[in-house]
Interface confidence: medium
């Protein structure tokens, strides 16, 4: 429905709060170099223009887009081209190409300081003296860190960190209330961030057509009660809704999603048998709390799939009557009887269906082409099992840092040009795959462990794609979106790469790394594993052992000497040398 | 949700002729199965024609019409016809227009319960 003032209506819609939140995540994940109180004052106008434009929607400018009107607030911005260079040229443009422009310049890695967490009483009291200045640094500081975060969903957060702030900074022991709360919001927020990433590389990079797929595959297995209508129009409007939020439409994602959470639970007898506690709440844990919904129960007696798509004489008529339809259907039907399978693992199956219905529809007898289709999924359903089997196996064997740093080497080893950084950061991330799927039972290991893995390898991705270095990495990122996990598994050690120059530096430790959290003295340890394999990368597990072995005492040993700097410089050569002469360097 | 209207009923003569029209509001029109269903006066509601979802690909009728009503569909405008000739006076009912989700190689359902929306239905009055 046409509005005469877009601004006005999503003013009037989302409220002022959650507009000037939302306008303030918009600003910082565009432009993420700029400082909190230059977005404030961005934020405060735009609002400020808005409610003129909800007293009168045919006031001056108010029948502007929603992109018009904040692409020429952003480009007021006085220092855009000394702090960001050619994306002021965005501002030469007009909208749609303009925002277009903004968008190909988020930065998923920009160059910002890491957020150090102040002592829990300077947190508080910065908490008391101005609670909405604090609430909005963290969205600020959220959102320039994390240029795709869901922002419906950073409101959510927001929600949680204030809560945690108003019950904490009145308890006894502040911190043993506190700490505990921040580090499960710091980690589900990068959880969070991560898993929307990929939400938006597959609707920029694969397209459309590739999250739709996604999506009825997962809703499916969700709702496998709801009809195929129902998980089309959930689809629909799902996708809006991303694509709205990965375009950098806030608001209209935002309010899209809140219909969207008012529509399922209005109508979630004929969706879902679990989300009756959902729908009790507020719209923000209302919308969150859908989005996590655990599956509903497969209805009882579901037919057999090959009497409609594989026995019936008129697969290839309904094929070509409507092919995304008849392949959504496949994919519907099949999700909805394997919650067991990875959404990934059954697009594979949609994909090599509608593969072979391609090639069998235009053979001289289709049916007897297509007759053993499902023949064919039986390899690819094999293969994540094995893989998750052997894997779960070893980490079982060797705890999550040991199960890192196997990952480490092997993919230090497949693609030895990323940076260090990046191996270390997606490495360590794969690694968290053990503790986060093994613990599960069989029926839930695959879905947990091949989509966990996705989501961290399209990490591995967006960031080599900002300054691309390895053509294997390329290759595995851009031909499948579903097959990126088998692509790196089947990586072989790269034969072409030509080891790094060693460089003493890069070994050389100081008293510091003795005040670290174990978290980042395993980041350090890990980081010279990396280092490493660059320089040996036909180095053997026994010999890598040995030599973090060697390492892990030398730490500890330094950490525990009184004069610690002067044992980091003359043990630290002693263990240079003798790892070189270890790898034979 | 979606909707159901049904449209195109009337009074007509015994012999005569009438197009019913059901438009469905779902793009996804084309995944669904279409039925027609009639409701006399102290009668039970009764299966009358219906279509799978793809155009055509499977048709069925109740005896009591067969020959006489045609029952097609256009994907495209997501709406759904029943093209009524030769009506008799026991063809006078409320006409309802029902929609399915059902696997694709099946035929269109005769039992109400495997139908999920409903219009709220057309009148069509046949008079001797």
């Known amino acids: 429905d046409a509005h005469k003032s877009e601004v006005a209506h999503r003013f009037k819609d989302l409220g002022e709060e959650n507009f000037k939140a939302l306008v303030l995540i918009a600003f910082a994940q565009y432009l993420q170099q700029c400082p909190f109180e230059d977005h404030v004052k961005l934020v405060n106008e735009v609002t400020e223009f808005a409610k003129t434009c909800v007293a009168d929607e045919s006031a001056e400018n108010c029948d502007k887009s929603l992109h018009t009107l904040f692409g020429d607030k952003l480009c007021t911005v006085a220092t855009l081209r000394e702090t960001y260079g050619e994306m002021a040229d965005c501002c030469a443009k007009q909208e749609p190409e303009r925002n277009e422009c903004f968008l190909q310049h988020k930065d998923d890695n920009p160059n910002l300081p890491r957020l150090v967490r102040p002592e829990v009483d300077v947190m508080c009291t910065a908490f008391h003296d101005n609670e909405e200045t604090f609430l909005k640094k963290y969205l600020y500081e959220i959102a320039r860190r994390h240029p795709y975060f869901y922002a419906p969903e950073l409101l959510f957060f927001a929600k949680r960190y204030k809560a945690a702030f108003t019950e904490c900074c009145q308890a006894a022991d502040k911190a043993a209330c506190l700490l505990p709360k921040l580090d499960e919001l710091r980690d589900e927020g990068k959880a969070s961030s991560a898993k929307q990433r990929l939400k938006c590389a597959s609707l920029q990079k694969f397209g459309e057509r590739a999250f739709k797929a996604w999506a009825v595959a997962r809703l499916s297995q969700r709702f496998p009660k709801a009809e195929f209508a129902e998980v089309s129009k959930l689809v629909t409007d799902l996708t809006k809704v991303h694509t709205e939020c990965c375009h950098g439409d806030l608001l209209e994602c935002a309010d899209d999603r809140a219909d969207l959470a008012k529509y399922i639970c209005e109508n979630q007898d004929s969706i879902s048998s679990k989300l009756k506690e959902c729908c009790e709440k507020p719209l923000l844990e209302k919308s969150h709390c859908i989005a996590e919904v655990e599956n509903d129960e497969m209805p009882a007696d579901l037919p057999s799939l090959a009497a409609d798509f594989v026995e019936s004489k008129d697969v290839c008529k309904n094929y070509a009557e409507a092919k995304d339809v008849f392949l959504g259907m496949f994919l519907y039907e099949y999700a909805r009887r394997h919650p067991d399978y990875s959404v990934v693992l059954l697009l594979r199956l949609a994909k090599t269906y509608e593969t072979t219905l391609e090639k069998c529809c235009a053979a001289a007898d289709p049916h007897e082409c297509y007759a053993k289709v499902f023949d064919e999924f039986k390899p690819l359903v094999e293969e994540p099992q094995n893989l998750i089997k052997q894997n779960c196996e070893l980490f079982e064997q060797l705890g999550e840092y040991k199960f890192q740093n196997a990952l480490l080497v092997r993919y230090t080893k497949k693609v030895p040009q990323v940076s260090t950084p990046t191996l270390v950061e997606v490495s360590r991330n794969l690694g968290k795959v053990g503790s986060k799927c093994c613990k599960h039972p069989e029926a839930k290991r695959m879905p947990c462990a091949e989509d966990y893995l996705s989501v961290v390898l399209n990490q591995l991705c967006v960031l080599h794609e900002k300054t691309p270095v390895s053509d294997r990495v390329t290759k595995c990122c851009t031909e499948s979106l579903v097959n990126r996990r088998p692509c790196f598994s089947a990586l072989e050690v790269d034969e072409t790469y030509v080891p790094k120059e060693f460089n003493a530096e890069t070994f050389t430790f100081h008293a510091d790394i003795c005040t670290l959290s174990e978290k980042e003295r395993q980041i350090k340890k890990q980081t010279a594993l990396v280092e490493l394999v660059k320089h040996k990368p036909k180095a053997t597990k026994e010999q890598l052992k040995a030599v973090m072995d060697d390492f892990a005492a030398f730490v500890e040993k330094c950490c525990k000497a009184d004069d610690k700097e002067t044992c980091f410089a003359e043990e630290g050569k002693k263990l240079v040398a003798a790892s070189q002469a270890a790898l034979g360097l | 949700q979606l909707q159901v209207v049904e449209s195109g009923g009337g009074l007509v003569q015994a012999g005569g002729s009438l197009r019913l029209s059901c438009a469905a509001s779902e793009r996804t029109f084309v995944a669904y199965a279409m039925g027609w269903f009639r409701q006399a006066p102290e009668k039970e509601r009764e299966f009358v024609a219906g279509?799978?979802?793809?155009?055509?690909?499977?048709?069925d009728y109740a005896d009591s019409v067969e020959g006489r009503f045609t029952i097609s569909r256009d994907n495209a405008k997501n709406t759904a016809y029943l093209q009524m000739n030769n009506l008799k006076p026991e063809d006078t009912a409320v006409y309802y227009c029902?929609?399915?989700?059902?696997?694709?190689?099946?035929?269109?359902?005769?039992?109400?319960?495997?139908?999920?929306?409903w219009g709220h239905g057309t009148q069509v009055t046949v008079s001797s």
């Open positions: 029902a929609i399915s989700h059902q696997l694709p190689g099946g035929r269109p359902g005769r039992d109400m319960d495997s139908y999920s929306y």
């Open positions: 279509i799978s979802w793809f155009a055509g690909a499977t048709t």
